[in-house]
């Protein structure tokens, strides 16, 4: 069946060194356990995180994300997942694409991450 992929409507903000969560879901909600679900970074499709065959797959994960990502899938039975990125870097800033794919259909959603320096303070006027 067909579905839409829905990500955050506004840019998500994170501080360097912190962790950040990027939510993504399908609508109408359905069990995504048997789907291929992932995040990649356009324009070169570098794999941030990939889930298939009921488990996380790190075979194609970009080196800069190795050991820094976790897919929160407690609600994957309802088509809801969240990507957690630990130890956020300035290089993480920019676009991410989340996709859900089953055997007959695929959709994706774009989202943006803004990374800020925790030590940069603007003094009050």
């Amino acid at each position: 069946g067909q579905f839409r992929v829905i990500g955050p409507r506004h840019p998500i903000r994170a501080l360097v060194g912190d962790e950040v969560e990027l939510p993504c879901r399908i609508s109408p909600g359905k069990n995504a356990t048997g789907m291929e679900v992932g995040w990649y970074r356009p324009p070169f499709s570098r794999v941030v995180h990939l889930y298939r065959n009921g488990k996380d797959q790190d075979g194609d994960q970009a080196p800069e994300y190795r050991g820094r990502t976790e897919l929160l899938k407690d609600a994957i039975g309802e088509g809801k997942v969240t990507l957690r990125i630990r130890n956020v870097r300035f290089s993480d800033e920019g676009g991410f694409t989340c996709f859900f794919r089953d055997h007959s259909y695929q959709e994706e959603a774009a989202m943006e991450l803004k990374v800020e320096d925790p030590f940069y303070w603007v003094s009050p006027g």
Partner: antibody, heavy 121, light 108 residues
Framework: EVQLLESGGGLVQPGGSLRLSCAAS????????MSWVRQAPGKGLEWVSA????????YYADSVKGRFTISRDNSKNTLYLQMNSLRAEDTAVYYC??????FGVGSFDYWGQGTLVTVSS | DIQMTQSPSTLSASVGDRVTITCRAS??????LAWYQQKPGKAPKLLIY???SLESGVPSRFSGSGSGTEFTLTISSLQPDDFATYYC??????????FGQGTKVEIK
């Protein structure tokens, strides 16, 4: 309608090279991993190689690793298999197959008609 | 590598028969298994994926079952068009795949 059309097969001597092509149409080519699967005369199916939708990741069977190279040109909707150091045991019909996944190897929902590669002196 | 073993290698049956083909994996592959039909001189055709999901356009007389290491393809009432060779394929491995050796269903 999804169509996959292989070409480039033929007779080649042992140690020789051949380049197979697969022209794809009827689907968003760059969104799907693609594979080559071969079938020796009178034998079963053997997966040979695969490539991710973007072309950034490639995968090979041990029997062809180091001799065969898979690639794709998403601007031309075409899949390739460069075969070097060919052996008699590489003789087979080579099928191009569309996967349902973007990365890695899954099941194949569309296949081409195949192209015959014969390695013989 | 995961090995796939099909049985029987050849099966003789008549139109209307219920036919069952078995596929065993050398290690657990959960439900990540596909079945294909191939006729002489033609490309394989996907019938079943994820062990039991029927591919779009495939007649409902075909069904798949099983999980772990043992799987079956069943044709509830064999039709003239079903005489062919059937292959199972494990899709559990992320970066490779393997097929069974095939089961030829021939006319008794």
């Amino acid at each position: 309608e999804v169509q996959l059309l292989e070409s480039g097969g033929g007779l080649v001597q042992p140690g020789g090279s051949l380049r197979l092509s697969c022209a794809a149409s009827g689907f968003t080519f760059s969104s799907y991993a693609m594979s080559w699967v071969r079938q020796a005369p009178g034998k079963g199916l053997e997966w040979v190689s695969a490539i991710s939708g973007s072309g950034g990741s490639t995968y090979y069977a041990d029997s062809v690793k180091g001799r065969f190279t898979i690639s794709r040109d998403n601007s031309k909707n075409t899949l390739y298999l460069q075969m070097n150091s060919l052996r008699a045991e590489d003789t087979a019909v080579y099928y191009c197959a569309k996967d349902w996944v973007y990365f890695g190897v899954g099941s194949f929902d569309y296949w081409g008609q195949g192209t015959l590669v014969t390695v013989s002196s | 590598d995961i090995q796939m073993t099909q049985s029987p290698s050849t099966l003789s049956a008549s139109v209307g028969d219920r036919v069952t083909i078995t596929c065993r994996a050398s290690q657990s592959i959960s439900s990540w298994l596909a079945w294909y039909q191939q006729k002489p001189g033609k490309a394989p055709k996907l019938l079943i994926y994820d062990a039991s999901s029927l591919e779009s356009g495939v007649p409902s007389r075909f069904s798949g079952s099983g999980s772990g290491t043992e799987f079956t393809l069943t044709i509830s009432s064999l039709q003239p068009d079903d005489f062919a060779t059937y292959y199972c394929q494990q899709t559990h491995s992320y970066s490779s795949t393997t097929f069974g050796q095939g089961t030829k269903v021939e006319i008794k």
